[in-house]
Interface confidence: medium
């Protein structure tokens, strides 16, 4: 079973401290080699993937991950129980919902089991690393002759999210963007009845419950108006682009070690 786990790149909003221990030696030993950085993302507060670049190791190494929460009731060191693999080498760890405490400082330690002194520790603020699922169930309703209202749902995290709405008409080359607060509702006051509109939304865990920088995936687009992509080259281009973006996202493959919680995979 090859289940792909998608993990966005970058962890710029994490507060990171590294502690590297090396054996004193005259020649360069394995223990002096830096360990790869661990990047963690909390997907919709349903599970968390902490991943690292296993290919940065000079030779294939099954690095191990331990974690705990600093200055809390959950400060007991825990072993990863659910490793992610890339080409049969550990490249990440998946933590389930019950193991995630957003508002406690998460400490993650990567270690080379063959060189126990070779280890790196990072401290992360998980509330800044939440990535929500894409908004769902987009609906449009006409408020008046020329006014449209767009509504959508987010699974679980409603009041914690801000949103970005993009819309364009058939013949627009680029999107118009509008930020929306936690109310997940957007009104377009002036609609041209002769044009077909496309709307899409993405969401971010910011600012009420955290300060995440990463947006969700875009929602599936919703359309208003008469034309179809068969009549409009820009909509065809948009649909074809979406296929490209999906393929690009599937570029870096990471496989799950076990079959549990597969329904939690990061969907598009």
């Amino acid at each position: 079973l090859n289940t792909t786990i998608l993990t966005p790149n970058g962890n710029e909003d994490a507060t990171t401290d590294f502690f590297l221990t090396s054996m004193p030696t005259d020649s360069l030993s394995v223990s002096t080699l830096p360990l790869p950085e661990v990047q963690c993302f909390v997907f919709n507060v349903e599970y968390m993937n902490c991943t690292w670049n296993s290919s940065s190791e000079p030779q294939p190494t099954n690095l191990t991950l331990h974690y705990w929460y600093k200055n809390s009731d959950n400060d007991k060191v825990q072993k990863c129980s659910h490793y992610l693999f890339s080409e049969e080498i550990t490249s990440g760890c998946q933590l389930q919902k019950k193991e995630i405490h957003l508002y406690q400082t998460f400490v993650v330690q990567l270690q080379d089991p063959r060189e126990p002194r070779r280890q790196a520790t990072q401290m992360l603020k998980l509330q800044n690393l939440v990535i929500p699922w894409a908004p769902e169930n987009l609906t449009l309703r006409k408020l008046s002759e020329s006014q449209l209202e767009l509504n959508w749902n987010n699974r679980f995290l409603n009041h914690c999210l801000e949103h970005l709405v993009q819309y364009r008409t058939d013949w627009d080359h680029s999107w118009t963007e509008q930020s929306v607060d936690y109310r997940h509702k957007f009104s377009l006051p002036s609609v041209d009845g002769q044009k077909r509109y496309t709307f899409r939304v993405r969401s971010r865990f910011n600012p009420l419950c955290g300060s995440a920088q990463h947006w969700s995936e875009w929602s599936h687009p919703i359309h208003w108006g008469s034309n179809s992509s068969k009549e409009n080259p820009f909509l065809f281009a948009l649909e074809a682009e979406q296929k490209l973006i999906s393929e690009e996202d599937l570029g870096g493959e990471q496989k799950l070690i076990s079959e549990e919680d597969l329904h939690h995979h990061h969907h598009h």
């Epitope: 080359h173 680029s174 992509s229 068969k230 080259p233 065809f236 281009a237 649909e239 074809a240 682009e241 296929k243 490209l244 393929e247 690009e248």
Partner: antibody, heavy 114, light 107 residues
Framework: QVQLVESGGGLVKPGGSLRLSCEAS????????MTWIRQAPGKGLEWIAY????????RYADSVKGRFSTSRDNAKNSLSLQMNSLRAEDTAVYYC???????WGQGTLVTVSS | DIQLTQSPSFLSASVGDRVTITCWAS??????LVWYQQKPGKAPNLLIY???ALQSGVPSRFSGSGSGTEFTLTISSLQPEDFASYYC?????????FGQGTKVEIK
């Protein structure tokens, strides 16, 4: 007027390098994925590369992977194709195009021969 | 990779003829198929996108149909300027691939 203009083709020896340029005008360049397609003399069309709108994602055909690289400068409305380790079988007319082929450049001929 | 096979490779026809070119895909590509016309020494020109949508400025004698794995380009009444090569291309899967082309010549 919407157009793409390629330049940089010419004669090069096997193993040599060449850089093709594609200048865009008449449309919002950074709103479009862009592609490179080539056509060997008397042969059909072969897609060789695409680049995303912001230039952060590129894909290449197996026939050129590791030898060719494409990049773009949205501020200058320009696209380029760097071709290294050229082979005789790379001889072709090279076209840049908007990503689903609605606008093409006029093409530039690259000849790889000793 | 998805293979596109065009048929016929060569076609001899007269002005006024109805001409049909077929493009088969080795797997389902939905409607992500385009058709081009190319004249000697020129860049290809987009005729049809999304399998059946006529590109702006293309004469209505050109039409496309099909979905999935079988597609056709039809020229309802061949004109002198239509003698050229025609290519299909799929955009459903990377790498994008072209058919081998169909050359339409004067009988």
């Amino acid at each position: 007027q919407v157009q793409l203009v390629e330049s940089g083709g010419g004669l090069v020896k096997p193993g040599g390098s060449l850089r093709l340029s594609c200048e865009a005008s008449g449309f919002t360049f950074n709103d479009f994925y862009m592609t490179w397609i080539r056509q060997a003399p008397g042969k059909g069309l072969e897609w060789i590369a695409y680049i995303s709108k912001s230039g952060d994602k590129m894909r290449y055909a197996d026939s050129v992977k590791g030898r060719f690289s494409t990049s773009r400068d949205n501020a200058k409305n320009s696209l380029s194709l760097q071709m290294n380790s050229l082979r005789a079988e790379d001889t072709a007319v090279y076209y840049c195009a908007r990503f689903y082929g609605d606008i093409w450049g006029q093409g530039t001929l690259v000849t790889v021969s000793s | 990779d998805i293979q596109l096979t065009q048929s016929p490779s060569f076609l001899s026809a007269s002005v006024g003829d109805r001409v049909t070119i077929t493009c088969w895909a080795s797997q389902d590509i939905s409607s992500f198929l385009v058709w081009y016309q190319q004249k000697p020494g020129k860049a290809p020109n987009l005729l049809i996108y999304a399998a059946s949508a006529l590109q702006s400025g293309v004469p209505s004698r050109f039409s496309g149909s099909g979905s999935g794995t079988e597609f056709t380009l039809t020229i309802s009444s061949l004109q002198p300027e239509d003698f050229a090569s025609y290519y299909c291309e799929q955009l459903n899967n990377y790498p994008w691939t072209f058919g081998q082309g169909t050359k339409v010549e004067i009988k």
